[in-house]
């Protein structure tokens, strides 16, 4: 019989990563922290009135490679950055909105600024 507090070696499992969350927190989140097996992210995008909105939080491992790849979406100004190097690493991410292209004014709805 093994002594209490003594067991066989653990099989490697993903270690949970804690991220800061803002506008993207789980229900009952304490101190605006979420937990993930994937990535922390910070994202900036334009809302319907053209104002920049910053969102941050957790991305699950499945599908996060695609989500963290900042592929341009037509008529949508958005930028996302992801990290895993340490807990709350997304506090230090500061994505910026991509510059407006002339095309955006032609193809998209007309915004009076």
């Amino acid at each position: 019989k093994k002594e209490d507090g003594e067991s066989t070696a653990p099989t490697p499992r993903p270690k949970v990563l804690r991220c800061k969350c803002h506008h993207h927190c789980p229900e009952d989140s304490v101190n605006n922290i979420c937990s993930t097996d994937g990535y922390c992210f910070t994202m900036i995008e334009e809302d319907d009135s053209g104002l920049p909105v910053v969102t941050s939080g957790c991305l699950g491992l499945e599908g996060s490679d695609f989500q963290c790849r900042d592929t341009p979406i037509p008529h949508q100004r958005r930028s996302i950055e992801c990290c895993t190097e340490r807990n709350e690493c997304n506090k230090d991410l500061h994505p910026t909105l991509p510059p407006l292209k002339n095309r955006d004014f032609v193809d998209g709805p007309i915004h009076h600024r």
Epitope: S7, K15, R18, D28, V30, S35, L59, G60, E62, N87
Partner: antibody, heavy 117, light 113 residues
Framework: QVQLQQPGAELVKPGASVKLSCKAS????????MHWVKQRPGQGLEWIGD????????NYNQKFKGKATLTVDTTSSTAYMQLSSLTSEDSAVYYC??????????WGQGTTLTVSS | DIVMTQSPSSLAMSVGQKVTMSCKSS????????????LAWYQQKPGQSPKLLVY???TRESGVPDRFIGSGSGTDFTLTISSVQAEDLADYFC?????????FGAGTKLELK
């Protein structure tokens, strides 16, 4: 094999502080979170908080903020929990436990803390 | 904080009987990103440390006898012991590992008739 070694008992006077230890072996210390859990006699389990030894990042249960301070010494693979301003309410068994995904894979044998004058 | 409620608080069973205990959470423990339920079960024998039985609601920890079966999803979970043995006399706790602060149920004490 994984071992989390804790002293069996500590006797401390009210108002004092105590630093409980948990010496880890049998695994890579920085690869798992270290948690501390309180259990009063005949009662349930309360999560105090956790620390990631790889970056010393800590989280605390709001109830234990200001009461508990978690630290690690990675050179000796030892985790510590300091409890301050002790009262009889702090008399309990304190367990250290490790996790990858916030469930507790392995537990220490527990330290029985008695606060008494 | 997520509140975990266990029932019954105690039950007395005979060797060979089937045992069922319940654990309910105040919010869903199902993560949409990976469709996993973040609930664990522990067994604590008198004078010993708790021991992990089940995690992600239904994944049995290696070395745990297959008579221990975890089930459920969302907010309602069950631990079943298909044929109780004398060595199963213990307290059983559920715990959510969905987000911090991590929280436990008050426990179910299994006694033998």
């Amino acid at each position: 094999q994984v071992q989390l070694q804790q002293p069996g008992a500590e006797l401390v006077k009210p108002g004092a502080s105590v630093k409980l230890s948990c010496k880890a072996s049998g695994y890579t210390f920085t690869s798992y979170w270290m948690h501390w859990v309180k259990q009063r006699p005949g009662q349930g389990l309360e999560w105090i908080g956790d620390i990631d030894p790889s970056d010393r990042y800590t989280n605390y249960n709001q109830k234990f903020k200001g009461k508990a301070t978690l630290t690690v010494d990675t050179t000796s693979s030892t985790a510590y929990m300091q409890l301050s301003s002790l009262t009889s309410e702090d008399s309990a068994v304190y367990y250290c436990a490790i996790s990858g995904w916030d469930y507790f894979d392995y537990w220490g044998q527990g330290t029985t803390l008695t606060v008494s004058s | 904080d997520i509140v975990m409620t266990q029932s019954p608080s105690s039950l007395a069973m005979s060797v060979g009987q089937k045992v069922t205990m319940s654990c309910k959470s105040s919010q869903s423990l199902l993560k949409s990103s990976n469709q996993k339920n973040y609930l664990a079960w522990y067994q604590q024998k008198p004078g010993q440390s708790p021991k992990l039985l089940v995690y992600f609601a239904s994944t049995r920890e290696s070395g745990v006898p297959d008579r221990f079966i975890g089930s459920g999803s969302g907010t309602d979970f069950t631990l079943t012991i298909s044929s109780v043995q004398a060595e199963d006399l213990a307290d059983y706790f559920c715990q959510q590992h969905y987000n911090i602060p991590l929280t436990f149920g008050a426990g179910t004490k299994l006694e033998l008739k």
